[in-house]
C-alpha cells in the first residue's frame, strides 16, 4: 500500500511540476521592470522567454515577438533549451509513469517491468526538474549581473544636458513559478525512485529451499509447484519486506476609447 | 455620445476647500481619470489621477498634502477635493479620460475656481 | 521632475504654409520595451478643453486632419501643419506621458500672419 501511496504521490507531484514548468515558460513575466526607488513611469515593461511586453496606465498592452534567434542573446538561447528539454523530458516520463503505476493494470506486465518504469520516469522526473531550476536560476543570474550594471550606469556622470534613465529589471514571476515547478518534479521524481526500490523483487528472498523428505532426499526448488501457497510464479506479485508488508492497490489588449480604467 | 461632464464654477476664501466633481456618460466607468488644472493665460499643469475600478491614485507631488480624488461607482462620478486654497490655485481644473500611449483623449469642459478673500 | 520645453513661444504662419512647433523633453521619452515615444500634442482653443491630436509621438488621433503630423524621438519632436488653416489657430501642448508627473510644455500660441 505505502509503495503504491508514494509511487502516486510522486506521480501527482510530478505532474504539478511539469504542469508549472510548461506554464513558467509560456509566462510572460520572466522578468518586470523594477519600480523601486526608481523614477516611476507610467508605462511597466515585463519581459519573458518569447516575447516582451508593455502595459500603458490607460489598460493597453502589447506584446512583442522576439522573431529573431540569432540576434538573440546565448544566455536567453541557453535557458529556452533547459525549459524546453525540462518540459520534454517530463513529457515522456509522465508517459513512462502512468504504464509503471502500480494501480493501473496493463496486460501480464510484471512487476520488474513496472519497478524498472518507475525507475525511469523518476530519473526523468529528477532531470527534468533540475533542467527547470537551472534555466531558472540561470536568467535569473542574468538578471542580477544587468541589474547591477545598469544601476552602475545610472548613478555614474553620463555627461550632456540630457539625462537618460535606464529601465532596470528585476525576478519576475515566472522565476519563482519555475523553481517551485521544478522542485515539485524533483521531489517526484525522488518520491518515483524510492516507489521503485519497493516495486523491485526481491530476488534474495526466496533462494532454493530443500524440504528433507523423511523417506527420500528431493529438493524443492521456488516455482516447482504453480498452485503452491509460498512460492511458484506468485513469488513476483507478493513481497515482503524488512520495513512492514507491502500489499498490491502560457497581445494584445486594446482599450476602446470609450472604455476607461 | 462621450461626455465627462463637470460641476459649476466656484469661489472659495483662502484657507478653504473645493470639491470638483466628474460625472462621466456614454462609456463604462473603469480606466483612470486624471486631473489638469490651468492657471488663467497659463499652461497645464497635472495634478493626478485616479482609478475609478479600485480607487488607486497617484499625486503629482506639488499637490500630495492638498489633495484627495475619490470616486462613486454609483454615479460614474469622481471627485477632487483641494484644501488649503491660495491665491494661485485660482485656475481652470479639469478633468480628464486617458487612451492610447496614456494620452487624454476626453476632457470635461473644465471648473472654474476662484480663490479670493 | 521632467522638464517640456516648446519653442517658440508663438509663431506667426501665413495661410496656406507650414507651422512647425517643437518640444524638447529633459530626458528620453522613448520606451525600449515597445520602441514607442510617449509624446502626446495637445490643440487648445480659447475657452475649451485641449483637443488630442498626436499621441506616441507621430499617432495621428483618428478624427484629426492629415495635415497634422508628430514626428521625432527621445528628447526632441515636432508637430507641423503642412497647410495652415484659419482654424488651425490655437495654443499647441506637448505633453510628456512616460514619467510621472505627467507634465505639459509651456505652449505655444499659432497665429495668422
Known amino acids: 500500500m505505502a509503495v503504491t501511496a508514494c509511487q502516486g504521490l510522486g506521480f501527482v507531484v510530478s505532474l504539478i511540476g511539469i504542469a508549472g514548468i510548461i506554464a513558467a515558460t509560456c509566462m510572460d513575466q520572466w522578468s518586470t521592470q523594477d519600480l523601486y526607488n526608481n523614477p516611476v513611469t507610467a508605462v511597466f515593461n515585463y519581459q519573458g522567454l518569447w516575447r516582451s511586453c508593455v502595459r500603458e496606465s490607460s489598460g493597453f498592452t502589447e506584446c512583442r515577438g522576439y522573431f529573431t534567434l540569432l540576434g538573440l542573446p546565448a544566455m536567453l538561447q541557453a535557458v529556452r533549451a533547459l525549459m524546453i528539454v525540462g518540459i520534454v523530458l517530463g513529457a515522456i516520463g509522465l508517459l513512462v509513469s502512468i504504464f509503471a503505476l502500480k494501480c493501473i493494470r496493463i496486460g501480464s506486465m510484471e512487476d520488474s517491468a513496472k519497478a524498472n518504469m518507475t525507475l525511469t520516469s523518476g530519473i526523468m522526473f529528477i532531470v527534468s526538474g533540475l533542467c527547470a531550476i537551472a534555466g531558472v536560476s540561470v536568467f535569473a543570474n542574468m538578471l542580477v549581473t544587468n541589474f547591477w550594471m545598469s544601476t552602475a550606469n545610472m548613478y555614474t556622470g553620463m555627461g550632456g544636458m540630457v539625462q537618460t534613465v535606464q529601465t532596470r529589471y528585476t525576478f519576475g514571476a515566472a522565476l519563482f513559478v519555475g523553481w517551485v515547478a521544478g522542485g515539485l518534479t524533483l521531489i517526484g521524481g525522488v518520491m518515483m525512485c524510492i516507489a521503485c526500490r519497493g516495486l523491485a523483487p526481491e530476488e534474495t528472498n526466496y533462494k532454493a529451499v530443500s524440504y528433507h523428505a523423511s523417506g527420500h532426499s528431493v529438493a524443492y526448488k521456488p516455482g516447482g509447484f504453480k498452485a503452491s501457497t509460498g512460492f511458484g510464479s506468485n513469488t513476483k506479485n507478493k513481497k515482503i519486506y524488512d520495513g512492514g508488508a507491502r500489499t498490491e492497490d502560457e497581445v494584445q489588449s486594446y482599450p476602446s476609447k470609450h472604455d476607461y480604467v | 455620445q462621450v461626455q465627462l461632464v463637470q460641476s459649476g464654477a466656484e469661489v472659495k476664501k483662502p484657507g478653504a476647500s473645493v470639491k470638483v466633481s466628474c460625472k462621466a456618460s456614454?462609456?463604462?466607468?473603469?480606466?483612470?481619470v486624471h486631473w489638469v488644472r490651468q492657471a488663467p493665460g497659463q499652461g497645464l499643469e497635472w495634478m493626478g489621477e485616479?482609478?475609478?475600478?479600485?480607487?488607486?491614485?497617484n499625486y503629482n507631488e506639488k499637490f500630495k498634502k492638498r489633495v484627495t480624488m475619490t470616486r462613486d461607482r454609483s454615479t460614474s462620478t469622481v471627485y477632487m477635493e483641494l484644501s488649503s486654497l491660495r491665491s494661485e490655485d485660482t485656475a481652470v481644473y479639469f478633468c480628464?479620460?486617458?487612451?492610447?500611449?496614456?494620452?487624454?483623449?476626453?476632457w470635461g469642459q473644465g471648473t472654474l475656481v476662484t480663490v479670493s478673500s | 521632475d521632467i522638464v517640456m520645453t516648446q519653442s517658440p513661444d508663438s509663431l506667426a504662419v501665413s495661410l496656406g504654409e507650414r507651422a512647425t512647433i517643437n518640444c524638447k523633453s529633459s530626458q528620453s521619452l522613448l520606451n525600449a520595451g515597445n520602441q514607442k515615444n510617449y509624446l502626446t500634442w495637445y490643440q487648445q482653443k480659447p475657452g475649451q478643453p485641449p483637443k488630442l491630436l498626436i499621441y506616441w509621438s507621430s499617432t495621428r488621433e483618428s478624427g484629426v486632419p492629415d495635415r497634422f503630423s508628430g514626428s521625432g524621438s527621445g528628447t526632441d519632436f515636432t508637430l507641423t501643419i503642412s497647410s495652415l488653416q484659419a482654424e488651425d489657430v490655437a495654443v499647441y501642448h506637448c505633453?510628456?506621458?512616460?514619467?510621472?508627473?505627467?507634465?505639459f510644455g509651456g505652449g505655444t500660441k499659432l497665429e495668422i500672419k
Open positions: 505633453q510628456n506621458n512616460y514619467y510621472y508627473p505627467l507634465t
Open positions: 485616479i482609478n475609478p475600478t479600485n480607487a488607486r491614485s
Open positions: 480628464a479620460g486617458i487612451y492610447y500611449g496614456n494620452s487624454f483623449a476626453h
Open positions: 456614454g462609456y463604462t466607468f473603469t480606466n483612470w
